[in-house]
C-alpha cells in the first residue's frame, strides 16, 4: 500500500494576511487566524513529517481584499510560488479582470500547473493561452505518480468576465475523456481538483469513472468529523464519501474558505491505484500555529503599497452621499442607490441576445451602509472612505429566488418599520411601494421589477412563481438581519466580488458621480 497526504485550500479570496475569526480584518492578533505565513508553517511541518505530500488549491484565490485590488493577481502567484503549491484549479473569480488579468499576473508567473479540463479556448485566444493552463497534470510524488485533473464552474460566464473566446463545457462531459486518457497513460491515482461547488463535486465522484478523490471549492463547504474547532457548522463528515456508479467509495473534500483551514486528507492506495482508506480533517489555522517569519516579512514588504493606495482618489462625487442610518434605515438613500447601481454594473454580462443582461435587481440591507461621504472634501472619494461605508469585508453575491421569496423579503424589510433597524432594504432595478398603515406581513402594495429579457428595460409587476436573479450582500444570502426566507428558499447562490472593490471600480469607471433619490422606494399616501 502507498499513502498520499493531500493538503488543500479553496476560496482563499485574497486573505494573504491573517484575519479575525470571521475572516474579516485582523484586529486582535492573538486571536487571528489563517494567512499565508501561518499556512506555510503548517504545510512545512507536514512536509517534514510525511513522505508523500501534495499541496493543492481548488480555485478562487482572486478577489476579496485590497490585496487583489492593488496587486491584481501578482500577489497570488508570488505567495503560492513561495508556499510551493503543487497545482491549482481555475475558479470563476480568476476571470474577474478578464482573460488578460489571468494570463499576465498568474498563468505566466505561476511555477505550478494551473488546471481546468472543461475550459476550451477558441479563436485568437487559443494560441495565446496554449499551454498556460492545462486539462490535467501528472505529478511525481515519491516513487509514484498522481494525475490531477481540473474543472471550473460552467456558470463562470455569468459570474465573472472570461470573455467570448473561452467555452465552459459541462464538467462531467469534459472530465471523463481526460481521466480515460490518464488511465490509458498508466496513471492509476487520479484527483479531480476543481471549482464548481459541493453538489457538482459529489456528482463528479459519482459519475466520472476513474476519479479516486475529489477536492473541491466554490460553495465554501465545511466538512468535519468530530467536534468542529471554530464557528463553522459542518455540512457533513470529512471526507464525505460518495459511492460511485461503478461501486467505488470516493472521498470528496472541501476546506471552507478564506484560508482559515488547511484541508488534510490521508489516502491509502493499493498497488493498482484503488483507494483502500481515507481519513483526515481540516486543520484550523489559529494563533497556536506561529506565522513563518520569512513569509511574514515578505507580506509586510508587500503591504506598504496597500497603505499608500488607501488614500488615493478613486473618483469624485458632486453630491452628498447620504449613508446615514437616519436615511438608509428609513427611506431610499442615495448611498444605497449608488451601491446597488455599482452592484448591477459589476454584473453586466451580455451572454444571450434575448437578454440585455442576465440580472437587473439588487437588494441591500440599509444596516450594511455604515457611513456617509461628504462631497465638501473637494468631492474626493478614496478606498478609505469606502471602507468606512462598507467595513465588514463582505461580497456582493448572485442568487436565484422565486418572486414569492422576494415578496417575503420586502415584507420583512418593513415588518417593524420605524425602529431604525438594519433590515430596511435599499434597491436597484426594483420599484416598491409600502403602506405602513397595513399590518406587518401585508405592507407591500406594489412591487415592480426591471425586465431582463427585453431590449428596452421597463418595470413589470413581480410574478410570484417566476425565478429571478438578484444581486445582494452575502450577509443577506446567509439569512442575516432576519432574512431567513432568503437563506431557506434560495435556488442558487454564487459568491461574488468584494463589496468595496465593486463600488470602487464603479466610481473609478464613472469618474464623477451624482446619485439621486429617485423614487425607487415609495410609501403610499397617508401611511408615511
Amino acid at each position: 500500500a502507498w499513502e498520499l497526504t493531500i493538503l488543500h485550500t479553496n476560496d482563499v479570496h485574497s486573505r494573504l494576511e491573517q484575519t479575525s475569526e470571521d475572516s474579516s480584518k485582523c484586529v486582535n492578533a492573538s486571536r487571528c487566524m489563517g494567512g499565508v505565513a501561518r499556512l506555510f508553517t503548517k504545510v512545512q511541518q507536514i512536509r517534514r513529517a510525511e513522505p508523500n505530500v501534495l499541496l493543492l488549491d481548488a480555485g478562487d484565490q482572486y478577489q476579496g481584499t485590497i490585496w487583489f485590488t492593488v496587486y491584481k493577481g501578482a500577489e497570488v502567484a508570488h505567495f503560492m510560488n513561495a508556499l510551493r503549491y503543487d497545482a491549482m484549479a481555475l475558479g470563476n473569480h480568476e476571470f474577474d479582470n478578464g482573460v488578460e488579468g489571468l494570463i499576465e499576473p498568474l498563468l505566466k508567473e505561476a511555477k505550478f500547473p494551473i488546471l481546468s479540463a472543461n475550459i476550451k479556448a477558441k479563436g485568437p485566444l487559443a494560441s495565446q493561452i496554449s499551454g498556460l493552463y492545462l486539462p490535467y497534470k501528472v505529478l511525481p510524488v515519491g516513487d509514484e505518480v498522481v494525475g490531477i485533473v481540473g474543472y471550473t464552474s460552467k456558470e463562470t460566464p455569468f459570474l465573472s468576465n472570461p470573455g467570448t473566446n473561452l467555452v465552459f463545457e459541462d464538467e462531467i462531459t469534459a472530465l471523463q475523456p481526460e481521466v480515460d486518457k490518464l488511465k490509458t497513460l498508466n496513471v492509476n491515482k487520479i484527483i479531480a481538483l476543481g471549482h464548481s461547488g459541493f453538489e457538482m463535486d459529489k456528482l463528479i465522484a459519482q459519475k466520472v469513472r476513474g476519479v479516486d478523490v475529489v477536492v473541491g471549492g466554490h460553495s465554501n463547504t465545511f466538512l468535519y468529523t468530530g467536534n468542529p474547532p471554530s464557528k463553522e457548522v459542518p455540512a457533513g463528515k470529512y471526507p464525505f464519501i460518495v459511492t460511485s456508479d461503478d461501486g467505488r467509495k470516493v472521498p470528496v473534500v472541501q476546506a471552507y474558505a478564506f484560508g482559515k483551514y488547511l484541508g488534510y486528507l490521508k489516502i491509502e492506495f493499493d498497488e493498482r491505484g484503488n483507494v483502500i482508506s481515507s481519513h483526515g480533517n481540516p486543520i484550523l489555522l489559529n494563533s497556536s500555529i506561529p506565522e513563518d517569519p520569512s513569509i511574514k516579512a515578505d507580506i509586510n514588504k508587500w503591504r506598504i503599497k496597500l497603505d499608500n493606495y488607501s488614500t488615493q482618489e478613486l473618483g469624485k462625487t458632486i453630491v452628498y452621499l447620504d449613508g446615514s442610518s437616519q436615511s438608509c434605515r428609513f427611506r431610499e438613500c442615495n448611498m444605497g442607490n449608488l451601491i446597488c447601481d455599482a452592484m448591477i454594473n459589476n454584473n453586466l454580462r451580455h451572454t444571450d441576445e434575448m437578454f440585455w443582461n442576465h440580472v437587473s435587481m439588487c437588494i441591500l440591507n440599509g444596516g450594511g451602509i455604515r457611513s456617509p461621504i461628504d462631497e465638501r472634501n473637494n468631492g474626493t472619494i478614496t478606498w478609505e472612505n469606502l471602507a468606512a461605508v462598507l467595513p465588514f469585508g463582505g461580497t456582493f453575491d448572485l442568487v436565484q429566488l422565486k418572486g414569492s421569496t422576494l415578496k417575503k423579503a420586502f415584507e420583512h424589510s418593513v415588518h417593524r418599520y420605524g425602529q431604525s433597524t438594519g433590515e430596511f432594504l435599499q434597491v436597484g432595478g426594483i420599484h416598491v411601494v409600502y403602506d405602513l398603515s397595513r399590518k406587518p406581513g401585508d405592507r407591500v402594495v406594489k412591487l415592480d421589477v426591471l425586465c431582463t429579457k427585453c431590449r428596452v428595460p421597463s418595470y413589470d409587476p413581480l410574478k410570484m412563481d417566476e425565478v429571478y436573479k438578484v444581486i445582494l450582500p452575502n450577509f443577506l444570502a446567509n439569512g442575516g438581519d432576519g432574512f431567513q426566507m432568503i437563506k431557506d428558499e434560495l435556488l442558487r447562490h454564487d459568491s461574488g466580488d468584494q463589496d468595496i472593490n465593486v463600488v470602487s471600480t464603479y466610481i473609478s469607471k464613472m469618474k464623477v458621480i451624482y446619485p439621486a433619490v429617485e423614487g425607487r422606494i415609495k410609501f403610499s399616501t397617508g401611511s408615511h
Partner: antibody, heavy 120, light 107 residues
Framework: QVQLVESGGGVVQPGRSLRLSCAAS????????MHWVRQAPGKGLEWVAV????????YYADSVKGRFTISRDNSKNTLYLQMNSLRAEDTAVYYC?????????????WGQGTMVTVSS | DIQLTQSPSSVSASVGDRVTITCRAS??????LAWYQQKPGKAPKLLIY???SLQSGVPSRFSGSGSGTDFTLTISSLQPEDFATYYC?????????FGGGTKVEIK
Amino acid sequence: QVQLVESGGGVVQPGRSLRLSCAASGFTFSHYGMHWVRQAPGKGLEWVAVISDEGSNKYYADSVKGRFTISRDNSKNTLYLQMNSLRAEDTAVYYCARGWLRYPIAFDIWGQGTMVTVSS
Amino acid sequence: DIQLTQSPSSVSASVGDRVTITCRASQDISSWLAWYQQKPGKAPKLLIYAASSLQSGVPSRFSGSGSGTDFTLTISSLQPEDFATYYCQQANDFPITFGGGTKVEIK
C-alpha cells in the same frame, strides 16, 4: 516466459483490408495496456495505437485514425489491429508491444514483428 | 503533438569510446522519456525509462539524464554489442512519439 507473437501480415493491394493478431503469453494480459508500433523499411519507429487493459479506451496516431481499429479479447489473450483502406505508406513491420504498468508508458516487451506490404 | 528531435542522426565511434546522444522535446515533458536500442531485423529493447532509470538487465554503462525538454543518453564505454540504432520516446501524452533515431556505427 513472457512472449508476444504477431501474425496476419502479408502483401495486400491499396484500399484493401488486413487484420493483424498478437498472441500474448507468460503474463496477466488483462492487466496491461497494449500497443501497436510500426517501422517502415529503413525508417524509424512510429506508434500506431493503444488499447487500455479492459478495452474501453483506445487512442490512435493521426495517420491511421478512422482507418485502423485496435481491439482485444482478454479471454483469448489476444490483441488485434484491423487495418482498412490501406495505403502504400502503411507498408511496415508491425510490432505489438506491452505498455508496462507504471507511468510513463514504456514498452518493455515487444513481439518479433509481422511485415505488411501494401502494393498494387 | 510532441515532437522529439534526436541528434546526431548517426555517429561513428570505436570500442571504449564515450558516446552521447541527445533528444529534444518540442514542449516540457518533465522527466517522462524512455530510450531504446534496436539492432537490424530485431525488435527494440528498452534501456532507460523516466529519463534516468536503468531497466533491469541493462548494463550500467548506459545512463540517461535530463528533464523538461533536453535529454541525453550516454554510453560510457562503447562495447561491440552496442553498435545499433537508439531511439528516444515520450508518453507524456497521446500520441506517443519517437525520435528519428541515432545510428551508432563502427569507426
